[in-house]
Every structure is written in C-alpha cells, then in structure tokens.
C-alpha cells in the first residue's frame, strides 16, 4: 500500500493516478522521435535535442527547465584521416586493412554524421609489432599469461575480446603489461546468441558490427581536465599530459569479420584452456606473433583521433515540492548516444520523457509532490559520465545537504526476460513493495505481480521467495551521486536471461545497428517492458518524493553489512598465517556491524511509533534516514581513488561496471601474496579494516536517538 499523501489536492492524485497516466504508446513515439538521427555528445544534433526536450518538459508542466552547459574534453576520429589496423608484410606493405566504417542498416544509408567505430580518448599513434591474444584482458587473464605461461606483452600489440569487464579496465591492464597498442573485438561467443539471426533479421551482431566506447580510467573524476570542479567558463584546466584517466597507448575496436583475419594467423602458445576460446574458426593461439608461414608479418595500428574541449548541455527540469522544497529526489538519464541510441540511451530517455509528462499532468491538475523532483537529461555520458558529474560538482554543496535519492534512467531494456535492479540497501523494501503492486508484463504471468515473475526468474541467492537485487557498480550516471556524494541511488531495467544468454551486454550495444527498429521489431513490439520500467522508475520517484516518511529501511543495510563483513573475512582467511603474524583481526568490524544492527533495529521501532503529525520530529527522523547513506562517505576517499568515497561500495578496481563491497579492504587484500613488502601490505589491510570499522560505527551513531 502506498504511503504517500496527497498534497494540495484531493486523494485521487496518488501513485495510482500517476502510474495510470503512463502510456506505452507515448514511450514508443518518444523513442522513435529520439532515434532518427545520431545524437553524439558535443554535436549540433545533440544540442538541438536538448532544446527540444527543454521545450517539451516546459509544455508538460514542469516549474522550470534549464540548460546547463560545460566545456569538457571529448574525443572524435579525424574525418580526413581514418583509423584502421593493417597486417603488413616484411616490406611494410599493407596486405590487409580493417574496415573504415560499419555498413549502415537499411533505410539509414543517407544519414550523415554517423561516427565510425573508434575508442574514445585513444591517443594518436601507429605502433607495429607482434600480436598477443589476451582473452578478455582481465586482471586474471594477464596473470595467466605472465605468471603461468611466462608470456611477455611488453612491446606487443594485444588483441582482446570485448565482454566481462569494462573496456577501460582492459586497456589499463594492457598498459600495465607493457603493450604498445590494444585491439578490441566482439567475439561471436559473447555477442552472437545461438539460434538468432544477425541484424536486420534478428538482434545479433553482424560480422561488420563494432562496439564503440570510451576507454578512460577516470575513477569518478568527471571531465579529465577539471577533476573535482565544474568545467565552467572560469575553470582551471590541466594540460593534456596531466589529464585524469587518459590511456597512453592507441586503442581501436573491430568486428568479428576483421578479427578473424588477425586471429587466424596467430601462432606461438596454444590457448591455456577452453575459457580462452571464442566461437570463431581460429585456433585462439596466444602468440606472440603469427604462425610459421606468416611469422614475418606484423600488425600495425593507424590511430589519428583527436581530443578537444567541447561544449555539452544538460537539461534540468524542476517540479517544486509543496512541503519540503529543499529536499531533492532526482531522476536522471543521458541523452547522448554513439549513433542512433535505439536502446542506449533513448529507450531510457523516452521513459523519462513519459514520466515527466505524467507528473506534469498531475501538476496541471493542482497536485504537487511533497518534495522537489529534479529531472535530468545528461550529456556526454558515453564520454565518461561527464554531464552528470560536472553538474553534481557544480551543485555538490546543495546536493549533499538536500539530496534524498537519485534514480538512474539509462537504457530501459537490455533484454526482455525479467526485471533487473541495482540499488542501495535502503531502497530494497521500496522496490519489493512497489513491484508487488505492479502487474507483470511477462508471458505466463498474466494477472500476477511483477514481484512474482521477477522472483521466479531471478531469485535471490540468499533468501528464498525474494528476487535478486545487485550492488551498484558504475559505468552510469548514478556514479557521482552514490560513490562520491553518498546519495541513496537505484536503477532498474528489463534484462536478458543470464542463465541461457551468456553473451556480454546485448549484441548490438554501441553499434550503428542499435536502432528504433531493433527495439520495435525484436525486443519490445508492444512497449510493455518499457512501460513496466517506467512504472518502476516513476513509482520509485513518486514514493521517494511523496511519502510522509522516507521509504528507506536501515535494517536492510544492517543485513548486508554483516554479509559483506563475512565475505571480506573469508577472503582474508586465505592467509591464516599472515593474519597471525601481523595480528590482523576483524573483531572490531564485526563489533561495529553488530552495533549498527542493534541501533538500526531500535531506530526502526522509533520510526514506527513516533508522532508523524509533529513536523519537527518528522523532519528529524527523515533527515536521519536521508543522511544515513551520506554517513558511509569518507571525505578522504579510497586509496588512489579520491572521488570514490563510499566505504561500503565502490566500482571494482578490476571492472568498473561491477560493485565491490568493503572496497578498501578488498583492494588491500587483492593479490597480497605477491607483494614485495608483506609487512607493509598487511599494515594496509589493518588500516582499511580500521577505516571500515570507524565508518560503520559512525553511521550507526547517526541513527541513535538524537538526545
């Protein structure tokens, strides 16, 4: 049952009214409108779309809609000097060249400004040398190569398949291994689901399709030239040599037709096991270099992309709260795309548009939310979450004092199997309660709740009868709000069946084939999954903005803290002798978690029983709930990652997309057995345990009775 109150209006303006106003047909129309031409960050087309969205949000009834601009570092291919990779013979002649563009899909042949596939922020360069195949280029793949197989990547060009981890981590790993260049490719094992046709006849990746994407390692910094501060007119900008997170070696992506030509000649060591072999008809030899007959041939990269400071535009819409206008609930998703953005981001942007329209309709009828709702259309997400991060940097003082929650709204779908939610534990109960009230769109679940189909298809690994909710990682616009500012955050989308579809992301991700037709023909012809995602995202925003008492349950944080403490203890216990030698103990952390659990339980009792008609008391209790996430922020940040400040969660150091719990301790323990100074290494483990202990205890104390 919704806990929201009606403000300034009759009780009919409740959650049901808001949800009923959301229409699949509108989302479909908006998606079509947003996907007819490319909207690459920093281009005129994307500026025009920003102005269109501004205009429409005003028409929908928001109180104000502003464009906020920033001048940030972006990266583009050189239009007259294209990027490509060649195989050269001993005379230096190019005997094979990779394609210069993706063949455009039918109906889009005459569209201008389709950016060719490139790795954004790659430096220029023309390295040549032998090739080494490095599987997914994960940390463990390089361990296997260097430690077990004794293969040295120094001075080599490495070729890695996309998937499993964020591409920026692959490039960082290759740099650390001494590679002089990186070739990224999409293997059919990861991007071609068996039994499905290639686009345009199905949703699989054709051989000429290529995944674009940035290869930064920003660690939450935002614009590489202005870390920590907004990239405005008076900002001090670093020189390019001091910029944050830029790769130091050339990188370029290719499709599997071109990859076949490079990989089929590979010689050297055989692949270590089947987990290193994809689905191409090639041996998947590791190298280095080509096999006997081709051993004199080399690979050469030709990369001429440029990085330039470019203006970007966010659209920020405001629906002022009637009772607590200084409390902000934010719904944000990006607008910029690599090409047409059929799924990423416009399936999300279309949902945001319809959510704004529904809220606007209620507002025109005299309703207002209790708290202020901010709507955001972020720019330059694809270039490193730049629009959202710059705006949050500019408004950080307001956000840290007033930010209640952030709900992310990138791609609404990455499949059509079941719901996928990642969020702070504070929102678990909100999500469970909301999905119990929504109807499932899934076949075979007619008349059943979304909660029921979600639980059936994606069960929690720990608790029977409940669905899985994952940790927040990064790779999307919630990052600055959650990882840097400590604002409770969540995201929801429809996803694939991870059990049967092992490929990474969806096959056409960041390719030219990510079109409106892809969605309308193959993923969601009735737009029923989009509608469900709109209901989940919109419903969360409605409850967060309108509930008298914030719909956060601190007891769920207690449960996960115990789970994460158990996990990190178990990892540490791999080294029982060192724990004894260096007197490493987790007792303090377990004690702090126990204290948190007891205090959270008592807080929940007080929350249930207090006089909700007392506005001072109500505000006080809500502030304790709002500021709980903030209490997990360490102002000093994580080691070498100052903008990742959340002590309980951070993006994994080995995969930006994944979340890691107690990341400070985890990173201190990682590969500790190979550290040259074990005493120092275990000292750092102890330091991180003490930071985690202090933070959990301090957070617990924010929930104690105020006086």
């Amino acid at each position: 049952k919704s806990s929201s109150e009606a403000t300034n209006i009759t009780p009919k303006h409740n959650m049901k009214a808001f949800l009923d106003e959301l229409k699949a047909e509108n989302i479909k129309k908006f998606l079509h409108n947003f996907t007819q031409i490319p909207h690459l960050a920093g281009t005129e087309q994307n500026f025009q779309l920003a102005k269109q969205i501004q205009s429409q949000w005003k028409e929908f009834g928001l109180d104000s809609v502003e464009l906020t601009h920033y001048d940030v570092l972006l990266s583009y291919p050189n239009k007259t000097h294209p990027n490509y990779i060649s195989i050269i013979n001993e005379d230096g002649n190019e005997i094979f060249n990779t394609s210069l563009f993706e063949p455009p899909p039918a109906g889009y042949e005459n569209v201008s400004d389709i950016v060719p596939p490139f790795s954004a922020f790659s430096p220029q360069g023309m390295p040549e040398g032998d090739l080494v195949y490095v599987n997914y280029a994960r940390t463990e793949d390089f361990f296997k190569l260097e430690r077990d197989m004794k293969i040295n990547c120094s001075g080599k060009i490495v070729i890695a398949r996309y998937g499993k981890v964020f591409r920026g981590n692959k490039v960082k790993n290759a740099q650390l291994a001494g590679a002089t260049g990186v070739i990224l490719y999409s293997d059919p094992a990861d991007y071609f689901a068996p039994g499905v046709k290639s686009y345009p006849d199905g949703w699989n990746l054709p051989g000429g399709g290529v995944q674009r994407g940035n290869i930064l390692n920003l660690n939450g910094a935002g614009d590489p030239l202005t870390p920590g501060y907004p990239a405005n007119e008076y900002a001090y900008r670093r020189g390019i040599a001091e910029a944050v997170g830029l790769p130091s070696i050339p990188v370029h992506p290719i499709g599997y037709y071109d990859a076949q030509k490079l990989l089929e000649k590979m010689g050297g060591s055989a692949s270590p096991d089947s987990s290193w072999r994809g689905s191409l008809k090639v041996p998947y030899n590791v190298g280095p270099g080509f096999t006997g007959n081709f051993s004199t041939q080399k690979v050469k990269m030709h990369i001429h992309s440029t990085s330039e400071v470019t203006r970007i535009y966010n659209v920020i819409g405001t629906l002022r709260g009637a009772v607590e206008p200084d409390r902000y609930v934010i719904l944000g998703g990006h607008r910029d795309s690599w090409v047409f953005g059929g799924i990423d981001p416009q399936s999300g942007a279309a949902v945001v548009h319809e959510i704004v329209r529904s809220f606007g309709t209620l507002k025109k009828e005299g309703w207002r939310p209790r708290r202020t709702i901010l709507f955001a259309s972020w720019d330059a997400e694809e270039f490193g979450l730049l629009g959202s991060t710059e705006w949050a940097e500019e408004n950080s003082r307001l956000l840290q004092e007033r930010g209640v929650a952030y709900i992310n709204a990138d791609s609404s779908i990455e499949g059509n199997y079941t719901l996928r939610v990642d969020c702070t534990p504070l929102m678990y109960s909100l999500v469970y309660n909301l999905t119990k009230e929504l109807e499932s769109p899934d076949e075979g679940f007619e008349g059943k709740s979304l909660y029921e189909s979600w639980t059936k298809k994606s069960p929690s690994p720990e608790f029977s009868g409940m669905p899985r909710i994952s940790k927040l990682g990064s790779g999307n616009d919630f990052e600055v709000f959650f990882q840097r500012l400590g604002i409770a955050s969540g995201r929801a989308r429809y996803t694939k069946n991870w059990e049967t579809n092992k490929f990474s992301s969806y096959p056409l991700y960041h390719s030219v084939y990510e079109t409106y037709e892809l969605v309308e023909k193959f993923y969601d012809p009735m737009f029923k999954y989009h509608l469900t995602v709109a209901q989940v995202r919109g419903g969360m925003v409605f409850e967060l903005a309108n509930s008298v008492v914030l719909p956060f349950d601190c007891r769920d944080y207690a449960v996960v803290l115990r789970k994460y403490a158990d996990k990190i203890y178990n990892i540490s216990m791999k080294h029982p002798q060192e724990m004894k030698t260096y007197s490493v103990s987790f007792d303090s952390l377990f004690s702090a978690v126990k204290n948190f659990t007891e205090i959270a339980s008592k807080f929940s009792e007080r929350l249930r029983d207090f006089d909700k008609s007392n506005p001072i008391l109500l505000r006080m209790m809500n502030d304790q709930l709002m500021f709980l996430e903030r209490a997990f922020i360490d102002p000093l940040g994580l080691p070498d990652r100052p903008f990742y400040r959340h002590v309980i969660y951070a993006p994994s150091s080995h995969n930006k997309y994944a979340g890691e719990s107690f990341p400070g301790i985890y990173d201190a323990l990682f590969d500790i057995e190979s550290k040259v100074d074990p005493s120092q290494a275990w000292g750092e483990v102890k330091r991180q345990i003490s930071i985690a202990t202090f933070t959990v205890q301090a957070a617990a104390e924010t929930l104690s009775e105020v006086a």
Epitope: N570, K574, E673
Partner: antibody, heavy 118, light 111 residues
C-alpha cells in the same frame, strides 16, 4: 572433531572420466585451503593443487596444470578432484588434506586408491 | 619447483637417535620458517609430526624434534621405538601459495 572422509576406491579404464570427493566436517569448510596429494605406488607425496572453497580459488602445481580439475561445493562441504580422460599413469593413491596457518597439512583424508587399467 | 632432497633411507636401533635431512633452496626451506614433517605408515595416510620447523602438535611424542640451518631442515627422532618405523616426508612453503614436498625417507628400526 575435524574429519576428511574420502570416497571409495575406483577401478577405471584408460580414457574414462572420474571425479573423486573429500567431505569435510567438524570445522568451517570455507575458510581453509584443501590440498590434493598424489602418491604413486612405492613413491613419494606430490602436491597436485589446492583450493579455497569460499570462492573456489584454485592453484595447480605446474606438472598437474591442465591434467586434472579441482573444485569444491561449499554447500555440502565437499572438495573434488576430477579427470576427463584417465591414463594408466594416473594409478595412485590420492589424499585430500586441510591446510592451516603455518602452511601445514594438519588433517588428512584416508586416501582413495585409483586404479587405471585396460 | 624441484622436490626437496631427503636421503632415501635412515636406520637406528631402538633407543638410538636418527636424523633425517631435507635440503631445499633459499626460495623454500631457506626463505621461510614453514617446514613441516609428516610420518606415513604403510597403507595409512600421512600424519603431521612437526610444523614451523620446530613445533610439535599435541599428541606427538617429544622425542620428535625439528631444526633448520640455512637451506637444510632436519628431523631428529631420539629414543627410537619400533612404531617409529615409517616413511617421513618434509614439506616447505615456497611463497605465493606454493608448497614443495620432500622425496621421502624410509626409517628402519633395527633389531
């Protein structure tokens, strides 16, 4: 009381697959490494590899890498050693052992005699 | 990693002492104080006798003792008894979760 109980003796033909087990009890299975040790007839002890059941982190001795697979199921406190294609030279006694602080093998299973013969 | 070198056999009369050597390198025996010794009777599983070079688990008679000098560790059985007749193996930690076993020594109690 800490115990490691191994499955029974096996007689197999060359080329067949085999999975032998080691069930632990009396301690927290997930937080101790388990090692598998081979002893060929009349020969000494050879460490094949070790596994940490909590996250199935597995390390193989170089001469056994790619020859066998070590795994664990923490839900039933059991470690496994398996072959996809046995050879006559795999005939041996196989022990599982718990590894504890001080890098010592403090508890051992009773051993499994595997005989591979055509 | 090569196996640690032990003498194939050693013997002594009841009541006498016998010492078994275990020679490795600076990467294993010489580099760590994590040498352990195991006793194995025919048809039985090995049993821990000494750990961390010199320490004895409870239940192991005090006539078993260990020591180390440089890259060589030693196990001494003083006051030899008939039940001490068995195979003895040393093992050493070699860093990064690597372990090296000795070649084994057959101890015979004469008489």
């Amino acid at each position: 009381e800490v115990q490691l109980v191994q499955s029974g003796a096996e007689v197999k033909k060359p080329g067949e697959s085999l999975k032998i087990s080691c069930k632990a009890s009396g301690y927290s299975f997930t937080t101790y490494w388990i090692g598998w040790v081979r002893q060929m007839p009349g020969k000494g002890l050879e460490l094949m590899g070790i596994i940490y059941p909590y996250d199935s982190d597995t390390r193989y001795s170089p001469s056994f890498q790619g020859q066998v697979t070590i795994s664990a199921d923490k839900s039933i406190n059991t470690a496994y050693l398996q072959w996809s294609s046995l050879k006559a030279s795999d005939t041996a006694m196989y022990y599982c052992a718990r590894i504890t602080g001080g890098y010592l093998f403090d508890y051992w299973g009773q051993g499994i005699l595997v005989t591979v013969s055509s | 990693q090569s196996a640690l070198t032990q003498p194939p056999s050693a013997s002594g009369s009841p009541g006498q002492s016998v010492t078994i050597s275990c020679t490795g390198t600076s990467s294993d025996v010489g580099g760590y104080n994590y040498v352990s010794w195991y006793q194995q009777h025919p048809g039985k599983a090995p049993k821990l006798m000494i750990y961390e070079v010199t320490k004895r688990p409870s239940g192991v008679p005090d006539r078993f003792s260990g020591s180390k000098s440089g890259n060589t560790a030693s196990l001494t059985v003083s006051g030899l008894q008939a039940e001490d007749e068995a195979d003895y193996y040393c093992t050493s930690y070699a860093g990064s979760n690597k372990y090296v076993f000795g070649t084994g020594t057959k101890v015979t109690v004469l008489g």
